[in-house]
Every structure is written in structure tokens, then in C-alpha cells.
Interface confidence: low
């Protein structure tokens, strides 16, 4: 004979476990139904009645099958330096990620806790490593024969143009000035841009430790070797 299908609530076999989407209620000592995502347990099961589920209230959610008495509260609204990439629904929490031009300085389980502006490399420095969602731009000094004359979070050091006759030699922050009318370059002309990261902060200019709310005068920290940190390289 085929085994009978047990309907919740039911007592499990000795040493047995409850089925998928069921839980063992210690008080009733029965296997009872879990509530689906977007709902919570309004009334717990008894020996004779199954769990009663109810929808999550506004601004609360459950993401998994559960038997919690109350749904979880969605996180607070995204701050001004963030964008909401996942709305708060009955089945999922709000997720805030950093807006373009910022990166996540402090992550949390989902989304970002603290965004910081992407570092900009000052003239004479170029981007050595572009920013990512969770890491800042790394700048490096332009090597001899290359320059950057911009304050940018994306520009790399570019080669000086090659002149027939040099009017002004180039340096790390300025291109060479030629007297010939049609100079050539050792590489493709024009500024070279690295792709902008999805969410990205300001290097080597006087700092902008804070975004638009920062004071007019930025606070310059001393030049020195970078404290060691994972995934960080010095200039």
C-alpha cells in the first residue's frame, strides 16, 4: 500500500524530521507549516490546528519560509549619496548602493552602510587602479615621458607628444609644447579614460573628505606612506 500523506499538523516519526517548508513546534510537539515569504506566523499551530499566516505590514518583509511572529523591518531610506537598487517589498529588504562617483567604504550584509566619494588624481598623477563598487581609485605619479594635467578619477598618465622641435619640455603635469604644426604622439592622442565603475571618491588634490556637505576649506593630511591595508597599494 502506498504511504499515507500526512497533513499538517502531524506528529513526526520518532527520530524523524519534518518535511520541507515545515517546522517542528516544541509546544505542540507537531510538524507544522511554515509561512511563505512575504508572510509571518499570526497564530502558531496546536495539536489540532495548523499555523495561521498573515501578510507582512508595510515597510516589513520576510524573505524566506518562516514561522516568525513579526516580519522584519526594512532598512532606513537610502541616504543622499546612495541610490535604492532594490525597493522594500513584503518579500525583500531595501538595498542601497552608492551613487555614481562614489564607492562603498563600509559594506553591510546587503548593500552599503557608508559611501565615500571616489578619489581624484591630481595633475601629475594618473589612475593606477580604477575604483570599483567597494574600493577606491589608486593614483600613481606619472612616469618620465608621461603626464596628466587633469584632476580626475578616470584619467591615466598619457605620453608626451613627440615634437620635431620642442618649445617647452613636458613634465608630469604638462604635455610638451611643440613648434611644429603637426606633432605626432607615441600613442593615440586625446585623454584616455578608464571605464567609470558602477558605484564609486576624491586623491592627491587637497582632500574632499566629505561630499557637498563638506566645509569650504578642505583639511590636508600630511603626506606620508600609506598605512598597510588589504587591497591597497601606495602611489
Amino acid at each position: 500500500l502506498p504511504a499515507q500523506v500526512a497533513f499538517t499538523p502531524y506528529a513526526p516519526e520518532p527520530g524523524g524530521t519534518c518535511r520541507l517548508r515545515e517546522y517542528y513546534d516544541q509546544t505542540a510537539q507537531m510538524c507544522c507549516s511554515k509561512c511563505p515569504p512575504g508572510q509571518h506566523a499570526k497564530v502558531f499551530c496546536t495539536k489540532t490546528s495548523d499555523t495561521v499566516c498573515d501578510s507582512c505590514e508595510d515597510s516589513t518583509y520576510t524573505q524566506l519560509w518562516n514561522w516568525v511572529p513579526e516580519c522584519l523591518s526594512c532598512g532606513s531610506r537610502c541616504s543622499s549619496d546612495q541610490v535604492e537598487t532594490q525597493a522594500c517589498t513584503r518579500e525583500q529588504n531595501r538595498i542601497c548602493t552608492c551613487r555614481p562617483g562614489w564607492y562603498c567604504a563600509l559594506t553591510k550584509q546587503e548593500g552599503c552602510r557608508l559611501c565615500a566619494p571616489l578619489r581624484k588624481c591630481r595633475p601629475g598623477f594618473g589612475v593606477a587602479r580604477p575604483g570599483t563598487e567597494t574600493s577606491d581609485v589608486v593614483c600613481k605619479p606619472c612616469a618620465p615621458g608621461t603626464f596628466s594635467n587633469t584632476t580626475s578619477s578616470t584619467d591615466i598618465c598619457r605620453p608626451h607628444q613627440i615634437c620635431n622641435v620642442v618649445a617647452v619640455p613636458g613634465n608630469a603635469s604638462m604635455d610638451a609644447v611643440c613648434t611644429s604644426t603637426s606633432p605626432t604622439r607615441s600613442m593615440a592622442p586625446g585623454p584616455v579614460h578608464l571605464p567609470q565603475p558602477v558605484s564609486t571618491r576624491s586623491q592627491h588634490t587637497q582632500p574632499t573628505p566629505a561630499p557637498s556637505t563638506a566645509p569650504g576649506t578642505s583639511f590636508l593630511l600630511p603626506v606620508g606612506p600609506s598605512p598597510p591595508a588589504e587591497g591597497s597599494t601606495g602611489d
Epitope: A116, R119, D136, S202, Q203, H204, T205, Q206, P207, P209, S218, F219, L220, L221, P222, V223, G224, P225, S226, P227, P228, A229, S232, G234, D235
Partner: nanobody, 117 residues
């Protein structure tokens, strides 16, 4: 690894005072300028105050000038923020931060300051 740990936050009434501390480890503390940055609920980051590596220069955001004082004790690898005459708009998560060449690359986890009656 660079570590910054803030403490001293809490609930205080308007007009009251608090002293935040930030302990640093994993780097030569005395060689680095330190900053305090805050984030009010639902708002962006706001730089509050900074102090040079040797303590010779301190600077403050206009919103806290005359009320907040930053100081450091290199023997204890600690920077402090003395906050007096606190206002409700000072309610925020306060972060201690440092880095090289003026950039704030290293942040603590923050300490909550709530000013409410």
C-alpha cells in the same frame, strides 16, 4: 591591518557634552593626520574636524566651530573629539578616519551620538 575604533557616543540632552575617542592600530599613528566625519540619519557624509600628525594644525566645519575641539594623544594612539553645547542637528553616526596625502582611506565603524530631550 589598519584599525580605527571609536567610542564615547551616547544619548545626551541639548546643551550637553560628550567626548568621543578613536584608537588607532596597525599603522604609525603619530605620522598621520586624523579626521572626524559624521553622517546624520538619511543624509550624506559631513566632515567635522581634523588634526595634523603633530597636532600643530586643527580645523573645523563651520557648523561645529567654537563648540567642538579635536585633540590627540600619540602615546595612547588616540584622537579625541570634545563636543560641547550639543544641538539636535549634531545627532549622527560619528566616524574617525585617516589616510595618506589628504585622503580618508581608513575608517572606523562609527559611534552613535543622539542629542534629544
Amino acid at each position: 591591518d589598519v584599525q580605527l575604533v571609536e567610542s564615547g557616543g551616547g544619548l545626551v540632552q541639548p546643551g550637553g557634552s560628550l567626548r568621543l575617542s578613536c584608537g588607532g592600530s596597525g599603522f604609525t599613528f603619530s605620522s598621520y593626520g586624523m579626521s572626524w566625519v559624521r553622517q546624520a540619519p538619511g543624509k550624506g557624509l559631513e566632515w567635522v574636524s581634523g588634526i595634523y600628525d603633530d597636532g600643530s594644525v586643527t580645523d573645523y566645519a563651520d557648523s561645529v566651530k567654537g563648540r567642538f575641539t579635536i585633540s590627540r594623544d600619540d602615546a595612547k594612539n588616540t584622537v579625541y573629539l570634545q563636543m560641547n553645547s550639543l544641538k539636535s542637528e549634531d545627532t549622527a553616526l560619528y566616524y574617525c578616519a585617516t589616510g595618506e596625502d589628504g585622503e580618508l582611506n581608513y575608517w572606523g565603524q562609527g559611534t552613535q551620538v543622539t542629542v534629544s530631550s
